[in-house]
């Protein structure tokens, strides 16, 4: 089938296009090109007769067309008007006609665009701005760039007019940016110069600096005012409501007490028509005022809160000093001073941080001290302590228990017996107790300020007969020559005598044995393996006595220097070598052997059958006690002689 291909399809103005013919039939008489989608004599461009090779221009010929023998048509120096359809009319030798249509599009080289704006000086939070990309060009695509980035997504940004217009609603100072537009068609792309959006804003509330408001007589007062504003604000100063000057800075040398008052900075933006003011109160002291301490937290909670203590007033060019407990500040990571030393911050306060705290202002002659400030640190309650510590009572006596827990404010106490609330007092008193008063006695301490509660439980036993005591130990496996062991006879009972026996004998006299806590506690210092004995404690009062079960002390020791047996060191070739290693140790040690430094086996016995002189060397036994963390070793030299070379040699085992 006869077809026309346009090369290229999108043609730039001024370039050329080739209408390339495919599948041209055989045996042709000639062909003709027409502008448009049909054969129309008035729109003929050119005709060609094959027999004469004669090309004849038609009414639509522009002088820019060239026809080739293969029927293709080249159009040079393309103009916009050339856009559209072209029809090839082929006349075959048998006078049967055939037609095909092709097309191309002509695009201009785009002009450089420019941006027009409907508002050159929009006001923040009030105006909208519409940017339009000029000129309006047919078949062009429009794009926008802000600070060389594609447009951000924002409900305040809107594209319209085929993306040719970019509208910014309710402009803000952040819209001050570089805006560019880009135009595109298939053959060119152009970009405008940037337009900087000049958003008028402010003035914001002015800031007066420096911030300090207290001055000494004789100093210079130099106040500066700044307000964010576009265009820059115009400034005016008022003192006590009276206009002073129209400058950004206010300077008054050698001030006196009479210069105290309210200082107002007014910022004015002539373009937005807005005014904003800020007032600061300046106090001029005839002499440095007595300082005082302010705190950001009057009741800090222990381990939770930080406290910032500030020395007032703030005075320019002043040295601030601090004292805690009448001492200069200790070095502590929890104490931080501000750059000007005016604020002392206590990080994560503790009950020990109560103070007192003093600050001082240093002048030429002396240091003025503030009154001391005590911090009221809320803490606790800690775990309550129930006293006395006895747990065993005889019937008929009075039970008087007292509870105490460190707390600020002081704790509120409650007593419970076997989980049942009894009374809300610090002390619990029960007269003439019986066995029925035995049970679990709980003291609950509550801090109403922190909301924290802590409890302690004590088991009270009321019995005429003393119970069978038991021994508790603070170290179940002490290491020889290193640890001490404290045995305590339980329970603690009122009006009771405590006794001790070792291996069924009364305590030997020894500087390493010490009784304490009313003989209730027996301490063995620097234990040895010989202390591994049976310990028994006994309790007695006027009506009964009782003994504990024995407790055997398990002393960890060793390993001592090992012994290798048999002691022989000379052997005959062919004998069996059977060495056994032993070391005193608790627990039993781990054994290992090395021959000439080379590790062998982890056994207590080393056996080598039919030794030869090759087995000469050093035989080392290594012992290790994992519980004590200690090691030991011994080395033995073994000599193996060839059979019959020397008399008196051992035959081995």
């Amino acid at each position: 089938k006869l077809t026309i291909e346009s090369t290229p399809f999108n043609v730039a103005e001024g370039k050329e296009v080739l209408l390339l013919v495919h599948n041209l039939p055989q045996h042709l008489f000639g062909y003709s090109w027409y502008k448009g989608e049909r054969v129309d004599g008035n729109r003929q461009i050119i005709g060609y007769v094959i027999g004469t090779q004669q090309a004849t221009p038609g009414p639509a010929y522009s002088g820019r067309e060239i026809i080739y023998p293969n029927a293709s048509l080249l159009i040079q120096n393309i103009i916009q008007n050339d856009t559209g359809f072209y029809t090839l009319h082929v006349i075959k030798s048998d006078l049967v006609n055939e037609e095909a249509t092709g097309q191309f599009r002509v695009y201009p080289e785009l002009p450089k665009p420019s941006i027009s704006s409907n508002n050159s000086k929009p006001v923040e939070d009030k105006d909208a701005v519409a940017f339009t990309c000029e000129p309006e060009t047919q078949d062009a695509t429009y794009l926008w760039w802000v600070n060389n980035q594609s447009l951000p997504v924002s409900p305040r940004l809107q594209l319209s007019n085929g993306n040719r217009t970019l509208t910014l609603f309710n402009v803000t100072r952040n819209d001050t940016a570089s805006y560019k537009c880009e135009t595109q068609n298939p053959v060119s792309a152009r970009r405008s110069d940037s337009v900087i959006l000049n958003v008028l804003y402010g003035p914001d509330a002015p800031t007066i600096s420096p911030l300090n408001t207290s001055y000494r007589s004789g100093e210079n007062l130099n106040l500066s005012c700044h307000a964010a504003s576009n265009p820059p604000a115009q400034y005016s100063w008022f003192v006590n409501g009276t206009f002073q000057q129209s400058t950004q800075e206010l300077f008054i040398p050698n001030i006196t007490v009479n210069n105290s008052g309210s200082y107002t900075c007014q910022a004015h933006n002539s373009d937005t028509g807005l005014n904003r003011t800020t007032v600061t109160t300046i106090t001029v002291y005839a002499e440095p005022p007595k300082p005082f301490i302010t705190s950001n937290n009057s009741n800090p909670v222990e381990d939770e809160d930080a406290v910032a203590l500030t020395c007032e007033p703030e005075i320019q060019n002043t040295t601030y000093l601090w004292w805690v407990n009448n001492q200069s500040l200790p070095v502590s990571p929890r104490l931080q001073l501000s750059n000007d030393n005016r604020t002392l911050t206590l990080l994560s306060v503790t009950r020990n941080d109560v103070g007192p705290y003093e600050c001082g202002i240093q002048n030429e002659l002396s240091v003025d001290h503030s009154d001391p400030v005590i911090l009221n640190v809320l803490y606790g309650p800690d775990d309550p302590t129930i006293s006395p510590s006895y747990t065993y009572y005889r019937p008929g006596v009075n039970l008087s228990l007292s509870c105490h827990a460190a707390s600020n404010p002081p704790a509120q106490y409650s007593w419970l017996i076997d989980g049942n609330i009894q009374q809300h007092t610090q002390e619990l008193f029960i007269s003439n107790i019986t066995e029925k008063n035995s049970g679990l006695y709980t003291c609950q301490a509550n801090n109403s300020a922190s909301g924290h509660s802590r409890t302690t439980v004590k088991t009270i036993t009321v019995s005429a007969e003393l119970p069978k005591p038991s021994i508790s130990s603070n170290n179940s496996k002490p290491v020889e020559d290193k640890d001490a062991v404290a045995f305590t006879c339980e329970p603690e009972a009122q009006n009771t005598t405590y006794l001790w026996w070792v291996n069924g004998q009364s305590l030997p006299v020894s500087p390493r044995l010490q009784l304490s806590n009313g003989n209730r506690t027996l301490t063995l210092f620097n234990v040895t393996r010989n202390d591994a004995r049976a310990y028994v404690c006994g309790i007695q009062n006027s009506v009964s006595a009782n003994r504990s079960d024995p407790v055997t002390l398990d002393v960890l020791y060793g390993p001592d220097t090992p012994i290798i047996s048999p002691p022989d060191s000379s052997y005959l070739s062919g004998a069996n070598l059977n060495l056994s290693c032993h070391s005193a140790s608790n627990p039993s040690p781990q054994y290992s052997w090395r021959i000439n430094g080379i590790p062998q086996q982890h056994t207590q016995v080393l056996f080598i059958a039919k030794i030869t002189p090759n087995n000469n060397g050093t035989y080392a036994c290594f012992v290790s006690n994992l519980a004590t963390g200690r090691n030991n070793s011994i080395v033995k030299s073994i000599t193996v002689s060839a059979s019959g070379t020397s008399p008196g040699l051992s035959a081995g085992a």
């Epitope: 450089k112 794009l143 053959v187 792309a189 152009r190």
Partner: nanobody, 123 residues
Framework: EVQLVESGGGVVQPGGSLRLSCAAS????????LGWFRQAPGKEREFVAA????????YYADSVEGRFTISRDNAKNTLYLQMNSLRPEDTALYYC????????????????WGQGTLVTVSS
Amino acid sequence: EVQLVESGGGVVQPGGSLRLSCAASGHTFSEYALGWFRQAPGKEREFVAAINWGGGWTYYADSVEGRFTISRDNAKNTLYLQMNSLRPEDTALYYCAASSDYAGGNPTGYPYWGQGTLVTVSS
């Protein structure tokens, strides 16, 4: 102003591929549209391909359409030309060009040019 240095040229057999690079320095790369042009011995400078500032628009000469691909990496300040199915008639000195306001096939629209890199397609 922007400085341009082309690289990646060389000798390649017909049907083979090459990737040309153009490294830019001296100015913000993304503010320039870029183009590739070529000049064979004894011939006029010829447009090859162009790309706009953001990389979303490209334009090719009819003779290379479908075989060559132009791309840019603004983070690396580099322009690329991937050339596939190379033909002997692609032999030329290849130039990189830059413009702050124009992207297209007209060499007069580009004020900044590199020194060129030679591509030879021969068996």
